[in-house]
Amino acid sequence: LQDPCSNCPAGTFCDNNRNQICSPCPPNSFSSAGGQRTCDICRQCKGVFRTRKECSSTSNAECDCTPGFHCLGAGCSMCEQDCKQGQELTKQGCKDCRFGTFNDQKRGICQPWTNCSLDGKSVLVNGTKESDAVCGPSPADLSPGASSVTPPAPAREPGHSPQ
């Protein structure tokens, strides 16, 4: 025998209290598939979240973050403070990248500049807080008098945590 609930479309639920009639989802709830015995409660976007997409009877609300914050996790499960390019978020707030490191985004941690000399190449463009070093040809490939000195990128200080 076919389950009468399987006929209930998305946006409704199979109401056991009413002889398994398909009832519309109550306000602030939704069902995204047919045959549901309950509707799910809509996600609320509070605090530093803002509503990207309103909840409907067939789909959940979607949140993103208010300006100055960016999403983390699947479905924007949390917001994190933006920093400027050339900075990283530490437990004391946004801090400039240390010498020898860069961050070209508003999120994430500062990364060490590419060490061109490790690949036997010269530095074409020096690294900055906001951008990586750009490597050029190896010094041997350069014409006489056009050699470039590549200081090694300093390592992070021991114990430095990128949090």
Epitope: I41, G47, V48, G73
Partner: antibody, heavy 119, light 107 residues
């Protein structure tokens, strides 16, 4: 079935440090925020700080800033809480707790680790 | 930081309705969760995002949050509900605050 298993009880001297571990099993480790919450004897719950392992992002309650460090090792699905410059008032049960993905509730808790600070 | 204030204790007769309040500036603008803790045990989430009940939590537990106050309501209170209850708030970032806790006594 998600489980958070914490390291065993510790007895520490004032001024020293303690590092408590919290190993997660039965779920995705790197996308869920792990928080550390402590409870002194007969007192309430106190949020210390948390980390989202997959993002390397940590944050701390103002009261503990500079004294607590929370880290995570994705390869072993383990979070750590290190508290330094211990004093007798730090005697407490320390819990790790996992936040639900999209909402604000801590749906899974470790069994707790008693840290006793005594000279 | 938002500060959350709870009454230290609430008493209720079996079968009656217990209400535990949690107040803080503009608390209704943030998410509120509630935890039950029995002696010697880890806390258990009973309400999240103001009014949602995790699976396995009895229907007699409900929550609301507006203005400056979040409320945990236990209707038809049972002896097994005697415990400490903590509210907690979340603003969407990696930052959480707990209230001081309320001891619920079932008379």
């Amino acid at each position: 079935q998600v489980q958070l298993v914490q390291s065993g009880a510790e007895v520490k001297k004032p001024g020293s440090s303690v590092k408590v571990s919290c190993k997660a099993s039965g779920g995705t480790f790197n996308s869920y925020a792990i928080s550390w919450v402590r409870q002194a004897p007969g007192q309430g719950l106190e949020w210390m700080g948390g980390i989202i392992p997959g993002f390397g992002t940590a944050n701390y309650a103002q009261k503990f800033q500079g004294r607590v460090t929370i880290t995570a090792d994705e390869s072993t699905s383990t979070a750590y809480m290190e508290l330094s410059s211990l004093r007798s008032e730090d005697t407490a049960v320390y819990y790790c707790a996992r936040k639900n993905e999209e909402d604000g509730g801590f749906d899974h808790w470790g069994q707790g680790t008693l840290v006793t600070v005594s000279s | 930081d938002i500060e959350l204030t709870q009454p230290p204790s609430v008493s209720v007769a079996p079968g009656q309705t217990a209400r535990i309040s949690c107040s803080g500036d503009n608390l209704g603008d943030y998410y509120a969760s509630w935890y039950q803790q029995k002696p010697g045990q880890a806390p258990v989430l009973v309400i999240y995002d103001d009014s949602n009940r995790p699976s396995g939590i009895p229907e007699r537990f409900s929550g609301s949050n507006s203005g400056n106050t979040a409320t945990l309501t236990i209707s038809g209170t049972q002896a097994e509900d005697e415990a400490d209850y903590y509210c907690q708030t979340w603003d969407g970032t990696l930052h959480f605050v707990f209230g001081g806790g309320t001891k619920l006594t079932v008379l």
